[in-house]
Every structure is written in C-alpha cells, then in structure tokens.
Interface confidence: low
C-alpha cells in the first residue's frame, strides 16, 4: 500500500494473507470462502493445498494467526493468464469453517443497490501487506482511502504504451489520485477494495486488487480493481454448487479450472 | 305306538372370555365390546403425541387376539409420550429449553439463537416444537437446523472498536 497508514485491530477483520509462490491477499466471505484475484493463485493451480492462508493478524510475520487451508480453488473461466486481467477473480474454498470474532469477520458482497456507494469520487479503502513507498513489503497491515476514478478517464490512462489497447474492461474499476501517491501495489493483489454501505452500516467488497502501472502511486495512473458486482451470480453459483460448509479436511485439494485455461509463461504484473 | 327316535345329546361349548382390555394411559381400545371371546381382537391407538411401545421397542401398530385359553396373545403396550430427544447442537449458536430444563417431549419448545454480534440466524426464527412424528420442527415446518450465518462487514473503523 502506497501512501497509507497502519491498520488497527478489528479495522479489516476480513483481511486474509495468502502465501504461495508470492505474497498476496484475499477477503473472507462467509466463514469458509476467500475471495481473491485469479492471478494471485494461478501459479498454485497444480497444488492448491500448498496455499498457506492466514487470518486474524495484523503483522505479516507474526506467529499468532489463524491458519486455514484450501480445499479447492475456483478460477473464473473467462480469466486468461497471458492476455490481460479481464475476469481476474477467484474463490478459495477453505477445508474448515473459521470461528468468527472481532479479528476475523467476513466482508459483505455488494447488494444490488451498492452501485450508489461506488460512484466516481466515492471513497473506497484498500488494505494489504504489499510494497510501500519505501520499497519493502509492509510488516504491519496497511490501508489507504482512495476515490473511485471515472471509468473513461481510467481507460484513457491505460490506452497509451506500454499498455495494450483495451486493457481496462467493463469488468474493472479504477481508484486513486490523479496526483498519485496513494495506491495499492505488488503484494496487495487479491485484497479487497471496500466501501461502506451507509444504509446498513456494513462494509462490502467493491473491488479486488488486480493490476496497475509499472510504478505504484504514479501520477496520472490508477490502481485497477476487479469489479465485484459484475460477478455476484458467478460467486453465488459456486458457493451454492460447492457447498457452504467446509468438509473438515481429508482428500487432496482441488484446483477447479475446467474452463479453457491456457498454460503460459508467467508475466510478472505488479499487483 | 311310541316312536323310537333315540337319544339327543346337546353339546355346548363356552369359549373363555378374555380379560377386558384396559387401555393404557393416553391410549384407547378399538373396537370396544362388552365381551371378547376366542378370535376376537382389539387394537390400541395412542393419542397424538404418544407412541406405542412394547418394552423398549416402538410398534407401528398393535392388535391382540383372544386365545382359546382366555388369554390375550400379546401384552398390553404402553402409549409413551413422543420424545424428540436432545436437540442437535447449532454451530456458532446455542439452544435454550423453553418448556422446562431438558424437556424434550411432545409439544416441548426450544429456542435456538446465534452467538451475538458475529452471527445472525437464517432460515427461520429459531423456535422449534417437538411434534408427534418425533422431530423438532420450526414454525415453518422445517425439520433441519436453522443456520447461524456470520455477520459480514463489521469493522472497528465504523463501530469504534468492539
């Protein structure tokens, strides 16, 4: 997180740390699912059980955390690893339910009315243990409040080289300051960009940290997030089809990618 | 001239009547007869909320037949109040006995509730009644447990810490 501040206990109780090949993040849904970015877990697709999932902690290196393990990983069938970041969304089913408390609480999915809290200039909050402006992964969970950017303005920002045309799709939303300085960064991938629903006084996930400019916090560029509201049917179908309840373990973890995933060389994108 | 018709011997047999069947508490006898003799039978039907038991064994139905020695061929069963048994534990919740401590018999009421703050009840209001079929049943007729679903989107940023 660039230009952010330290989170306090209970501020982001849905925050999940995912350790696999790299550091990434996710957000707890219900008590046995994690919402994350497809690119964050793609490398582990052949061994989903290798994902080390931690929650209930502020400190990235703390030994005090709640451990969870993956039973199955579901990558969106429209995500293609070597062709941009459209449909950069995945679900991890945990092999056990976690106990909910003030430090571990799920994030809400957006209601139909959520768009009214996610208009241009509405403030969302990104959190994570990713790179800070000092160039190191954060030891303490950090967060930053950033405004939503007009979609056309964001599309235009990424129309020029080195970004290929059409990088920003209708399945994405952008957030950040035109002047730069506040952004998500490498290592924050998969984490939630959350918004406060002022009617219910509950926080909901509007975006998933996905990608951005080569240099985090760069002026005139913005962080790009998967637009979660476009995927509510996909999320609900998977959760209903593959069960709300954790199985309690046993058996090998599955990586569900029954949808034309191309094996490709990994392009190192920063988020 | 006297007719020679010989002797007439009249045989009469009296079947032993069986003891009058007294219905067990919370049951009734059918059919009700003044007397039950050889091959007569009766059935016992329990009131709603009671089940037929022969010893420890539940019976689907009960019919006894009067035997020639004047005894019934089976013992009188009991009509025992249906017991739904202890309610299942509710993950992330608890159950309270409303009718009385540990009371799990017919028409007993229990109330499920979820752990405060972090869980909320889905499916129904959590009130279940022990019904005649031996199942705890919600006011909506569900026999499955309610669900304690985690409350989402709580944060110390808006609640000022918990």
């Amino acid at each position: 997180i660039y230009g952010g501040q330290k989170a306090k206990p209970g501020d982001f109780p849905w925050q999940v740390l995912i350790l696999g090949g790299t550091t990434a993040a996710g957000a707890l849904l219900y008590d046995n699912w994690v919402l994350t970015a497809a690119h964050a877990v793609y490398e582990q697709k052949h061994d989903a059980s290798a994902l080390d999932i931690r929650m209930g902690t502020l400190k990235r290196l703390s030994p005090h955390y709640t451990q969870a393990w993956s039973e199955a990983v579901f990558i969106h069938e429209g995500y293609t690893h070597d062709a941009g970041f459209d449909n950069d969304i995945a679900l991890i089913k945990l092999n056990n339910k976690v106990v909910i408390n003030s430090n571990i609480t799920p994030i809400c999915l957006p209601r139909k009315e959520a768009e009214s809290f996610m208009r241009t200039d509405d403030i969302g909050t990104a959190s994570g243990w990713g790179l800070t402006q000092r160039g190191f992964l954060a030891r303490n969970l950090m967060y930053v409040d950033i405004p939503i950017v007009d979609h056309q303005k964001c599309t235009a920002a990424y129309e020029k080289p080195p970004y290929p045309r059409g990088s920003v799709t209708a399945n994405m939303l952008c957030a950040g300051l035109e002047s730069g300085g506040k952004d998500s960064c490498r290592g924050d991938s998969g984490g939630a960009l959350v918004f406060l629903d002022s009617e219910t006084e509950r926080w909901f996930v509007g975006g998933i940290v996905s990608w951005g400019s080569m240099n985090c916090g760069e002026a005139g560029q913005y962080g790009v997030y998967t637009k979660v509201i476009n995927y509510i049917p996909w999320i609900e179908n998977i959760i209903s089809d593959f069960g709300g309840g954790g199985s309690g373990g046993g058996g090998s973890a599955k990586f569900v990618a029954a949808w034309t995933l191309k094996a490709a060389a990994h392009h190192h994108h920063h988020h | 001239m006297a007719s020679m018709t010989g002797w007439k011997i009249h045989y009469t047999s009296t079947a032993h009547a069986c003891p009058y069947p007294m219905a067990p508490p919370n049951g009734h006898v059918s059919p009700v007869q003044a007397k039950y003799i050889l091959k007569d039978s009766f059935s016992i039907f329990c009131e709603t909320g009671y089940e037929l038991l022969q010893g420890h064994l539940p019976l689907k139905s009960f019919t006894a037949v009067c035997q020639k020695d004047g005894s019934w061929d089976r013992p009188m069963p009991a009509c025992s109040i249906v017991d739904c048994g202890p309610p299942d534990d509710l993950p992330s919740g608890r159950v309270e006995y409303i009718t009385g401590p540990g009371v799990t018999t017919y028409k007993a009421v229990i109330q499920y509730s979820c752990e405060e703050t972090f869980y909320t009840m889905k499916v129904n209001d959590g009130k279940y009644v022990c019904e005649a079929d031996g199942f705890w049943t919600s006011s909506k007729g569900e026999k499955s447990l309610p669900v304690c679903e985690p409350v989402c989107g709580l944060s110390a940023r808006t609640t000022g810490g918990r």
Partner: antibody, heavy 125, light 107 residues
Amino acid sequence: EVQLVESGGGLVQPGGSLRLSCAASGFTFNDYNMAWVRQAPGKGLEWVATILFDGSRTYYRDSVKGRFTISRDNAKNSLYLQMNSLRAEDTAVYYCSTESPYYSEGYYQGYFDYWGQGTLVTVSS
Amino acid sequence: EIVLTQSPATLSLSPGERATLSCRASQSVSTSIHWYQQKPGQAPRLLIKYASRSISGIPARFSGSGSGTDFTLTISSLEPEDFAVYYCQQSYSSLYTFGQGTKLEIK
C-alpha cells in the same frame, strides 16, 4: 424352576477388564429381555444395562456407556457383561436379571422378576 | 434421569403392625413403579409391579398404590420375615432408576 447363575467376578485393578457370565435355565430364555443390575457394598440397587430378547438393541446407564457391553447367546441360554476400563466406583455385586417376558400381561417391560444370587466385582489397586 | 426418593430411610415397627412405605418420583411416571424386597445376603425379590399389580407367589398382605409422582407400598400386618430393605424402581424412562431404599426393622 427359574435359575440364573452369575460367574466371572473377582478382584481387578483400575483400568482392567472382566467378563461376567450368566447361565439361565428353567424358562424360555429367548422370550425375555435380560438385564444386569448392580449393588455397591452397603448401597442401593443400580440398573446397569439391558438387552432385548432377540439381541437387537442394548441400553446402558450413562456412567458405563462405552466401557461396558451387554450381549447374549440365545443358543447357549447365556447373558454376558464385558467390562473394560474398570473404575473403583464399579465395585459392586452384579446381578443378572430377567426383565419380564416379552409375551406377558402388562403395559411395559422394565421390572426385574427373576434374579441370580450375584457375583462380586472388586476394582482396587 | 428420574430420581426416586424413598421415605422414611428406616421404619421401626413390630410384627402385626401395618407398614406404609413411600416413594416419590422427581417427575410423573404414570404407574410405572415396581417394588422389591431384599434381605441381607440375598438378591432382591419383586413384590408389586405397575404400582399396584400383585405378583404370583407374593403374600396378599403386600399391596401398592399411587400414580404420577407419589407411591405407597403397604404391608397390612407385618410378619417376622418381612423385616428387610424395600426398594422402588421406575420404568417410565428406559434409564431405569431405583430409590435409595427403606429399611424396615423390628422395633
């Protein structure tokens, strides 16, 4: 004449095991539910376990569940009680008893009409 | 479990007298109460079943009454051989329980 003769009692250390037997005669064994009832020295009676006439179901008091197993062999007119993980509080005279005939007058079985003379089980180190 | 409480714990009477023994259940047990007699060094003996039903071979001086929660065993005229410990037992619940016993002793 109904006869029930228990055997298999004795001294055993805590945590140990014993198998009690009850040989039945003088009645149609497979018409009767059978039970074990115990009596600690100087104390009252305590029902331990029941097995139905055909062996289809067993019932236990809570304190012996998982440790004791009641069984029967109708061909041998015999009742058994396998006692594992014995505790000092299991010390008692164990009586074998019939639990009223399956085909008999009455509402409900559950009274003990014939009793053996008992066998003493002592659990002590 | 259903708790049976017998009273008195000890009853001192003389032969020829009438003995009244009480058994109270912690909840209603209908008429599912049975009475036993036990003499020192002997196994118990069934006296009365289902609160008031007589048992073949048991002298007529033994009788029982009651239903619900309160039950009584009555010995109309005590004989010397009647001095023993008496237990009630319930079968309303399949987790059978006995009372703690009443000792009937010679005065």
